[in-house]
Interface confidence: low
């Protein structure tokens, strides 16, 4: 389905509003430090050019690829070398190398200030004064901080952002209406960004076979009534969509995502009974709804898997004829029967099954060799079950903040070389698994917990790749996607680590502590906890708990004092000395 002008084709398919939004997202994800106004100017220039191509597809340059057009536009930025350094060298390359070069320079942890939320009246005035600019600013600010955010989904977030302001800026109590909605969008947005980052890492680091295996397992759980051929078609289409978005081809990605939603809604009967309410919604909402749809009910009469995958004498013949198809069918059959398993566990089982067939199909008596293959699955299944059980018990015993602290200590002891901000961020997010998953019924706990942990650990891997400091982290991150979480779980105290020298400055606090939000206070305390463990990796839980209780009491006391700064100056050194003594 070739078009004389790719840019005209996408403009017509997507419409001007979505076209402009997606180009802004693409440019903001590539040039993360550029000012907003610069990006708006570039987007307007590209849009005007696209309109000339819609009017005449034979016009000059309209036949160029989108990468060529967008890359040429990005390379017109005057301050490219001063702002981005070696990224400017990308502009000397030809496509497709130039786009690959831009992709490699995407920064998962850009040095950008945290977004500060203005007063509600200020936001409402800005929204009313210029709604279009207000919404573009939202797309720009999110995209530059999250360079792999799933672009068509970001348009959906922007639509919800707009709806929140449209409703709440007219409400009697604007803040009560708006702030919870903005909090929800922020939290959902961070989760969406992290989930997409794992998809892109899966594709970029482990290839489309790894992504397709993930998609087969997940879609088979969601659509257990669908035939294998139907699931395979959805997997192929979904892989194309995510490959495009992860590769910066946002217009193609959004267009193909819309086509996939259309296909699913036209073929509900052969996919799932749960799609109906999604399919009545407008495009952005529909695509989001389909992506989040709950698992359909399992067919009642599914036969045992053993007949086809263990007992049959044709297992090796079927495997040899088409290995990936046979393994894909195994994964499909196993996953549709087990919505209670995490996707990562299902992939481990498929890997174990593949390894057994590789070994046994070359043996003298293959059937005898693979007859007990399902028994070998038991420890693989029990490991995440036990992990979830133990950690949910710990979460229920400690509550979220102290559970996060337990994880901070655990992970700092495992990989003390990792930077303190990274350990705090990752451990805080690991700790959120408790509130997210432990309240769920037993059958939903493992898929919730382990697949969430995979997303959080991917963040650790992505940040660590930018600044590698630990061979153990590199090993867990690169050896096997599906075994990342078990690999990190298995790490013990790093005996080779040389403890960090004590630095009193790290434990010096001031009266500004008292004006911090509860979350910011927690982060400060957790930062100190990580530094303590780096200084004394063999400290016991009791010792660390004691120092942290002492710290909380010290901060509480000084924040209640009349002269707070004097209190911190006087009590701080005492706290440091007492802590050192306690950990000696």
């Amino acid at each position: 389905d070739t078009h004389k002008s790719e840019v005209a084709h996408r403009f017509k398919d997507l419409g001007e509003e979505h076209f402009k939004g997606l180009v802004l997202v693409a440019f903001s994800q590539y040039l993360q430090q550029c000012p907003f106004e610069e990006h708006v100017k570039l987007v307007n220039e590209v849009t005007e050019f696209a309109k000339t191509c819609v009017a005449d597809e034979s016009a000059e340059n309209c036949d160029k690829s989108l990468h060529t057009l967008f890359g040429d536009k990005l390379c017109t930025v005057a301050t490219l070398r001063e702002t981005y350094g070696e990224m400017a060298d990308c502009c000397a390359k030809q496509e497709p190398e130039r786009n690959e070069c831009f992709l490699q320079h995407k920064d998962d942890n850009p040095n950008l200030p945290p977004l500060v939320r203005p007063e509600v009246d200020v936001m409402c005035t800005a929204f009313h004064d210029n709604e279009a600019t207000f919404l573009k600013k939202y797309l720009y600010e999110v995209a530059r901080r999250h360079p792999y955010f799933y672009a068509p989904e970001l348009l959906f977030f922007a639509a919800r952002y707009k709806a929140a302001f449209a409703e709440c800026c007219q409400a009697a109590d604007k803040a009560a209406c708006l702030l919870p909605k903005l909090d929800e969008l922020r939290d959902e947005g961070k989760a969406s960004s992290a989930k997409q980052r794992l998809k892109c890492a899966s594709l970029q680091k482990f290839g489309d076979r790894a992504f397709k295996a993930w998609a087969v397992a997940r879609l088979s759980q969601k659509f257990p009534k669908a035939e294998f051929a139907e699931v395979s078609k959805l997997v192929t289409d979904l892989t194309k969509v995510h490959t495009e978005c992860c590769h910066g081809d946002l217009l193609e990605c959004a267009d193909d995502r819309a086509d996939l939603a259309k296909y699913m809604c036209e073929n509900q009967d052969s996919i799932s009974s749960k799609l109906k309410e999604c399919c009545d919604k407008p495009l952005l909402e529909k695509s989001h709804c389909l992506a989040e749809v709950e698992n359909d009910e399992m067919p009642a009469d599914l036969p045992s898997l053993a007949a086809d995958y263990v007992e049959s004498k044709d297992v090796c013949k079927n495997y040899a004829e088409a290995k990936d198809v046979f393994l894909g069918m195994f994964l499909y059959e196993y996953a549709r029967r087990h919505p209670d398993y995490s996707v990562m566990l299902l992939l481990r089982l498929a890997k174990a099954y593949e390894a057994t067939l590789e070994k046994c199909c070359a043996a003298a008596d293959p059937h005898e060799c693979y007859a007990k293959v399902f028994d070998e699955f038991q420890p693989l299944v029990e490991e995440p079950q036990n992990l979830v059980k133990q950690n949910c018990e710990l979460f229920e015993q400690l509550g979220e903040y102290k559970f996060q602290n337990a994880l901070l200590v655990r992970y700092t002891k495992k990989v003390p070389q990792v930077s303190t901000p990274t350990l705090v961020e990752v451990s805080r997010n690991l700790g959120k698994v408790g509130a997210k998953c432990c309240k769920l019924p037993e059958a939903k706990r493992m898929p919730c917990a382990e697949d969430y942990l995979s997303v959080v650990l991917n963040r650790l891997c992505v940040l660590h790749e930018k600044t590698p400091v630990s061979e153990k982290v590199t090993k867990c991150c690169t050896e096997s996607l599906v075994n990342r979480r078990p690999c990190f779980s298995a790490l013990e105290l790093d005996e080779a680590y040389v403890p960090k020298a004590f630095n009193a400055e790290t434990f010096t606090f001031h009266a500004d502590m008292c004006t911090l939000s509860e979350k910011e206070k927690q982060v400060k305390k957790q930062t100190a906890l990580v530094e303590l463990v780096k200084h004394k990796p063999k400290a016991t839980k009791e010792q660390l708990k004691g120092v942290m209780d002492n710290f909380a009491a010290f901060v509480e006391k000084c924040c209640k004092a009349d002269d707070k700064e004097a209190c911190f100056a006087e009590e701080g050194p005492k706290f440091v000395a007492a802590s050192q003594a306690a950990l000696a």
């Epitope: 004691g546 006391k557 007492a578 802590s579 306690a582």
Partner: nanobody, 115 residues
């Protein structure tokens, strides 16, 4: 090691007063901080009051102005004077002590506020 033994708990009417004591023995020369905590049935243990060797004190808002912590170093005893008691003060009250934080705990004494 430090041993702590609480006493003074009992039944009291709302608005009434009670004085708890905690006798410390063992390696008490290392004790810098002493505190009272309480735990109501089915609830988390809650901090009530703390006093340092130098005599500085702190309290949560829930008891401030009603409860007073004090210690007699010569008798190795910690006290908690509780006035204007309320039904929600019903709990087992624990004495705790330690050199840097409260790492030694007593067995607790029950306080019931009820009419």
């Amino acid at each position: 090691q430090v041993q702590l033994v609480e006493s003074g708990g009992g039944l009291v009417q709302p608005g009434g007063s009670l004085r708890l004591s905690c006798a410390a023995s063992g390696s008490i020369e290392s004790i810098n901080r002493m505190a009272w905590y309480r735990q109501a049935p089915g609830q988390q243990r809650e901090f009530v009051a703390r006093i340092s060797k130098g005599g500085s004190t702190n309290y949560p808002d829930s008891v401030k102005g009603r409860f007073t912590i004090s210690r007699d170093n010569s008798k190795n005893t910690l006290y908690l004077q509780m006035n204007s008691l309320r039904a929600e003060d019903t709990a087992v009250y624990y004495c705790a002590a330690g050199p840097v934080w409260e790492q030694f705990w007593g067995q607790g004494t029950l306080v019931t506020v009820s009419s």
